[in-house]
């Protein structure tokens, strides 16, 4: 349905509120390193602008696109040369062309200050102005995490907002609000996980790939709704999210409303679940969607065999309509089987359209596909066998001691990933014990697989800006679904040529004694990828070695009178025990 | 509440074709598959084939295969059925019908049409 | 494909009768996914019941289905007028989609 003003026509959808949110998220998130107050006053621009399309249409201006709005703000913006650099040339393109290279100068990594949240400040912050407390958080996120979902974040900030409403009055406000925003920093840091791997998708395989992760999940979640309901909802999550990781916020959050609405007029035909979610306000409703737990499968669903394996019929239904029946194998597998993670689901699904593939050229198809289920169970098991040695590592060693393993592990595998990179994405790797381990057999491979391919994401997204190992850039592009399984099966990288030794990494200072916890562990997790960059063939009990007295140097010098002396005087003894254990 | 209104009763001469529709209001068009089912005068139903209007997938039984197309358009929310080279035993009540889902284009009919007279005659 | 056999073909009865209908399958039906519809002259059919024994929305209690495998049975507990008519079982459970030849439920 076209419009005369589209600017008017998402104004008067959205309501002012949620219109200036999404214009900041979507400034925040391309101009990610501009000052709050420059963006407030753009989006002040563009909202009165909009007001005036609401009252005459036909203004001039009124009848752009999105985009030629959003752009020309953008292009206005005076400094845009001298903090971005060749993200100024978009400003000499055309629409489409600008806003696609706008998008492609987003930034996975900004170079941007750790949010360090102090209790008394940020009160007296909110209780001054708690409008532009809430734009700020707005602004914050999005600028660090430029494919963050928009409308989710709209519901973070009204929550954000929401925990200082209830600590700023209380008598300990720390102890209020920290372990609220710790809380909250996790949800929000896997949400926006989730939505870079739901962007990557579409950019990188297509939206065919978000489509059937979708009808996956969906089919696991709603296992009441039909088969073309689901391809329904899919096609329709799959435009929100297109339009979410293409810039386009406005139009997602409009669309992303229109689907919750429709959802909760047709739950008794979707699920049993959503009755709760379907009485919130919008924002809260599409969250509440999103995460509501799965329905309960229904009785006396016929075994998968019949339309798949035993049908004489199969060849020609798949050959007549492959992505329908392709969908329908999975939305049937996927509502069976909600203790299967959604990567494992579409392993099972490719492996079938291989099988069909292969079976449908030969003289007796039939002989050749009866026996696919017994082909896909190995897709079924390996994962299982893997959880299972893993969270038995996990359980001997901690979190800690696992993130450790698997940062050797991981550094052997792909010594020339940078080491923050490595760091990072092990720590990440190692918390999914904490996360996975402690859950009861039905819930471990979903929340493992699927937790696993949004860490492997952010490793193919962040080694993409600077590719530096053949193998990784294989294992994120070859198959979005079988990332995992190549990581895994990734050995040590035998042709790696070890890195000189730097003294400069293994030299410290009296700050590292003031560190949080967190922080010093990181710390040492560097030293240890460096010493495996540069020994990668070391030992267990070397690396063990030199890892203790790296921990006895610091706490002996944490506890000296005169520390930043102790960490020059022991330092280079240090160096040369260490070059000395790994020698 | 879905309903189905049928286009009206046909007379054929044989060889020709006929192509009948079925508008689909109340509900979601793009969220349910049509089916398409007919009965000669006195006579049983007969399931000719269905549609999933989403995909543009349909499917049709072996005695029909080569002479009947089921199409869709979502953006009327109508369904068509197109019977070529007809013949005399063609004459029958053709019905759309909304499938629930329960498998690969089988279900049961819940919505039906109300259905559409064509008669074959020289 | 599935055939369908229902009997009788005509059942004669009175109002306030108990009308029992029978449908036989030629091989099992998967999961019990058997329909049972009512065709009154000139109307679309309408459904009854499906999944073997699931009420259609707005279909008194007074109709009910039961069976398994290859023996369906729908009973109607106590005949209305309104209930004179021809009934159809059907069978989803494996493709093609197939209708027994219906069972005339007439007034003695």
């Known amino acids: 349905d076209t419009h005369k003003s589209e600017i008017a026509h998402r104004f008067k959808d959205l309501g002012e509120e949620h219109f200036k949110g999404l214009v900041l998220i979507a400034f925040s998130q391309y101009l990610q390193q501009c000052p709050f107050d420059e963006h407030v006053k753009l989006v002040n621009e563009l909202t009165e602008f909009a007001k005036t399309c609401v009252a005459d249409e036909s203004h001039a201006g009124c009848e752009k696109s999105l985009h030629t709005l959003f752009g020309d703000e953008l292009c206005k913006v005076a400094s845009l040369r001298e903090t971005y650099g060749d993200m100024a040339d978009c400003c000499e393109k055309q629409e489409p062309e600008r806003n696609e290279c706008f998008l492609s100068h987003k930034d996975d990594s900004p170079d941007l200050p750790k949010l360090k949240p102090d209790p008394n400040t940020l009160c007296d912050e909110f209780k001054a102005d708690e409008k532009k407390f809430w734009g700020k958080y707005l602004y914050e996120i999005a600028r660090r995490h430029p494919y963050f979902y928009a409308p989710e974040l709209l519901y973070y900030a009204n929550k954000y907002n929401g925990v200082f409403q209830e600590c700023c009055q209380a008598e300990d406000k720390g102890a209020c609000l920290l372990p609220k925003i710790e809380t909250m920093r996790e949800k929000v840091l896997a949400s926006s996980a989730r939505q870079r791997l739901r962007c990557a998708s579409i950019q990188k395989f297509g939206e065919r790939a978000l489509k059937a992760w979708s009808v996956a999940r969906l089919s696991q979640k709603f296992p009441k709704a039909e088969f073309v309901e689901v391809t329904k909802l899919v096609t329709d999550l799959t435009k929100v999210h297109k339009e979410c990781c293409h810039g386009d916020l406005l139009e997602c959050a409009d669309d992303r409303a229109d689907l919750a609405k429709y959802i909760c007029d047709n739950q008794d035909t979707i699920s049993s679940k959503l009755k709760e979610c379907c009485d919130k306000p919008l924002l809260e409703k599409s969250h509440c969607i999103a995460e509501v737990e799965k329905d309960a499968i229904p009785e006396n669903l016929p075994p998968l065999t019949a339309d798949f394996a035993e049908d004489k019929d199969v060849c020609k239904n798949y050959q007549e309509a492959k992505d329908a029946f392709l969908g329908s194998f999975l939305y049937e597998y996927s509502r069976r089987h909600p203790e299967y993670a959604v990567s494992v689901l579409l392993r099972l699904a490719k492996e079938y359209e291989a099988t069909l593939e292969e079976c449908c050229a030969k003289d007796d198809p039939h002989a050749c596909y009866s026996t696919v289920f017994d082909k896909l169970k190995h897709l079924v098991d390996e994962p299982q066998n893997l959880i299972k040695q893993n969270c038995d590592q996990f359980e001997k060693l901690g979190e800690y001691g696992f993130q450790n393993a698997l940062i050797v592990r991981y550094t052997r595998k792909v010594p020339q990933v940078s080491t923050p990179t490595l760091v990072e994405v092990s720590r990440s790797l190692g918390k999914v014990g904490t996360r996975c381990c402690t859950k009861p057999e039905s819930e471990r491979m979903p929340c493992t697989e699927d937790y696993l391919s949004l860490i492997l994401n952010r490793l193919c997204v962040l080694h993409e800006k600077t590719p530096v190992s053949e193998k990784v850039t294989k294992c994120c592009t070859e198959s979005l679904v079988n990332r995992r399984p190549c990581f895994s099966a990734l050995t040590p990288d035998e042709t790696y040529v070890p890195k000189a030794f730097d003294e400069k990494l293994f030299t410290f200072h009296a700050d590292i004694c003031t560190l949080p916890d967190t922080e010093k562990q990181i710390k040492k997790q560097t030293a240890l990828v460096e010493l495996l960059k540069h020994k990668p063939k070391a030992t267990e009990e070397q690396l063990k070695t030199v890892m203790e007295n790296f921990v006895a140097f610091v706490d002996k010098c944490c506890a000296a009178d005169d520390k930043e002396a102790c960490f020059a005087v022991e330092g280079p003894k240090l160096v040369v025990s260490t070059q000395t254990a790994l020698a | 509440q879905v309903q189905l209104v049928q286009s009206g009763a046909e007379v054929k001469k044989p060889g020709s074709s006929v192509k009948v529709s079925c508008k689909a209001s109340g509900g979601t068009f793009s969220s349910y598959a049509i089916s398409w089912v007919r009965q000669a005068p006195g006579q049983g139903l007969e399931w000719m084939g269905g549609?999933?209007?989403?995909?543009?997938?349909?499917n049709y039984a072996q005695k029909f295969q080569g002479r009947v197309t089921i199409t869709a358009d979502e953006s009327t929310s109508t369904a068509y059925m197109e019977l070529s080279s007809l013949r005399s035993e063609d004459t029958a009540v053709y019905y759309c019908a909304r499938i629930r889902w329960g498998g690969w284009f089988r279900g049961y009919l819940d919505y039906w049409g109300q259905g559409t007279l064509v008669t074959v005659s020289s | 494909e599935i055939v369908l056999t229902q009997s009788p073909g005509t059942l004669s009865l009175s109002p306030g009768e108990r009308a029992t209908l029978s449908c036989r399958a030629s091989q099992s039906v998967s999961s019990s996914y058997l329909a049972w519809y009512q065709q009154k002259p000139g109307q679309a059919p309408r459904l009854l019941i499906y999944g073997a024994s699931s009420r259609a929305t707005g279909i008194p209690d007074r109709f009910s289905g039961s069976g398994s495998g290859t023996d369906f049975t729908l009973t109607i507990s106590r005949l209305e007028p309104e209930d004179f008519a021809v009934y159809y079982c059907?069978?989803?459970?494996?493709?093609?989609?197939?209708f027994g030849q219906g069972t005339k439920v007439e007034i003695k």
């Open positions: 549609i999933i209007p989403i995909f543009g997938t349909a």
């Open positions: 059907q069978q989803y459970g494996s493709s093609p989609l197939t």
